[in-house]
Interface confidence: low
Amino acid sequence: GITIPRNPGCPNSEDKNFPRTVMVNLNIHNRNTNTNPKRSSDYYNRSTSPWNLHRNEDPERYPSVIWEAKCRHLGCINADGNVDYHMNSVPIQQEILVLRREPPHCPNSFRLEKILVSVGCTCVTPIVHHVA
Amino acid sequence: GITIPRNPGCPNSEDKNFPRTVMVNLNIHNRNTNTNPKRSSDYYNRSTSPWNLHRNEDPERYPSVIWEAKCRHLGCINADGNVDYHMNSVPIQQEILVLRREPPHCPNSFRLEKILVSVGCTCVTPIVHHVA
């Protein structure tokens, strides 16, 4: 019977776990042709809960570069341009799928991986814990 | 520059088409074991730019269910709990990778697809266009 390539150390599609290993065409189809990527590019600066973007690079991951948002302040920017600590800047997080090279350094063998990334920040009313 | 040596146990791939078709193990490795998924679950309600979450389901996509944020107001919620139209609620969007079944209905053949999703909303100072 046929198995997916089984050079030493390479993945194999075991019948028992099928379809554990699937074939993926990496020619990315981009559904975002009508969107302007710059449309939200300045929100990080104009937000009342501004953030900085940090480059997270990992050659063993696809995509290898992911941008992580870090909120600039614990509080939020008020109308006077000052930080108001009665409010909180919090990261909006999302679980995303990435491909992790497995075994390491293989150009065309991956495992699906779920990672949590911070996309931006929003300003929320803090939860106040009252002492009984 | 440094090149990481290719693992000799990697599946074969012709350079000409490399790496159009790759093997992907769908047993998801979750790096988020220490994160509490509920941690940010109420931000959508507590934010000064609150949002609703809409379920987007597509059986031909992996993951098949994606939650899309829609800002509730054009403006932001002020300290009095009213909508302040001097500020704007805007969606924070992110490009994410999903797997699209190709050909349709195939259980184990996919194409990588990039889609734009709204993760949440943030409150920004509006850009005021002055008339000359």
């Epitope: 390539p5 019948d15 379809p19 | 074969n12 078709t21």
Partner: antibody
Framework: EVQLLESGGGLVQPGGSLRLSCAAS????????MSWVRQAPGKGLEWVSA????????YYADSVKGRFTISRDNSKNTLYLQMNSLRAEDTAVYYC???????????WGQGTMVTVSS | NFMLTQPHSVSESPGKTVTISCTRS????????VQWYQQRPGSAPTIVIF?????PSGVPDRFSGSIDSSSNSASLTISRLKTEDEADYYC?????????FGGGTKLTVL
């Protein structure tokens, strides 16, 4: 080891019917789509029909649509091809194949001969 | 439906390299995987290349597959030819609801 064993072939008159079976072993049958491919004497390969692992989706070549029915019994690890209104041009060796992915026949049986002649 | 066109026959000497082409009549070849099957006389076909360029275990690295989107064609290349490579070779592709084989190419190792 994957094994596919076809049976049910034979001589049949034009307009007649025949039911082919394919007994599968060595793998989790219900996890795989299965196909029938035929080869007329001295000719090339021709895809006939395919069925999803659950049996919920079936596909047919235009040349057999409406006459042939593919089905499977996952409890018996068996694939079937019910052939009605047979014609002389249906004469061929019929192979059962396990699909690696849709449209990719990864493992093949040895085939069963079907002869349609008066 | 589309068709896959292959040369009827090719021949080459042992130790040499031979390439068999397969052209898709309509629909982009790049959108669907191409497979190659080997069939020796009196035997069932066996897959030698799947998903354009992937080799199943047990298939020698002398066999390689490629596609050329500009000509909408696929190729099977066999290097360091051996007498045991003499067989019929079929390319195969598909659409979302049907599967199509090429007419086959008879490879003669002189």
């Amino acid at each position: 080891e994957v094994q596919l064993l076809e049976s049910g072939g034979g001589l049949v008159q034009p307009g007649g019917s025949l039911r082919l079976s394919c007994a599968a072993s060595g793998f989790t049958f219900s996890s795989y789509a299965m196909s029938w491919v035929r080869q007329a004497p001295g000719k090339g390969l021709e895809w006939v029909s395919a069925i999803s692992g659950s049996g919920g989706s079936t596909y047919y070549a235009d040349s057999v649509k409406g006459r042939f029915t593919i089905s499977r019994d996952n409890s018996k690890n068996t694939l079937y091809l019910q052939m009605n209104s047979l014609r002389a041009e249906d004469t061929a060796v019929y192979y059962c194949a396990r699909d690696l992915i849709w449209g990719v026949a990864g493992s093949w049986g040895q085939g069963t001969m079907v002869t349609v002649s008066s | 439906n589309f068709m896959l066109t292959q040369p009827h026959s090719v021949s080459e000497s042992p130790g040499k390299t031979v390439t068999i082409s397969c052209t898709r009549s309509s629909g982009s070849l790049a959108n669907y995987y191409v497979q190659w099957y080997q069939q020796r006389p009196g035997s069932a076909p066996t897959i030698v290349i799947f998903a354009n360029n992937q080799r199943p275990s047990g298939v020698p690295d002398r066999f390689s597959g490629s596609i050329d989107s500009s000509s909408n064609s696929a190729s099977l290349t066999i290097s360091r030819l051996k007498t045991e490579d003499e067989a019929d070779y079929y390319c195969q592709s598909y659409s979302p609801s049907s599967v199509v084989f090429g007419g086959g190419t008879k490879l003669t190792v002189l």
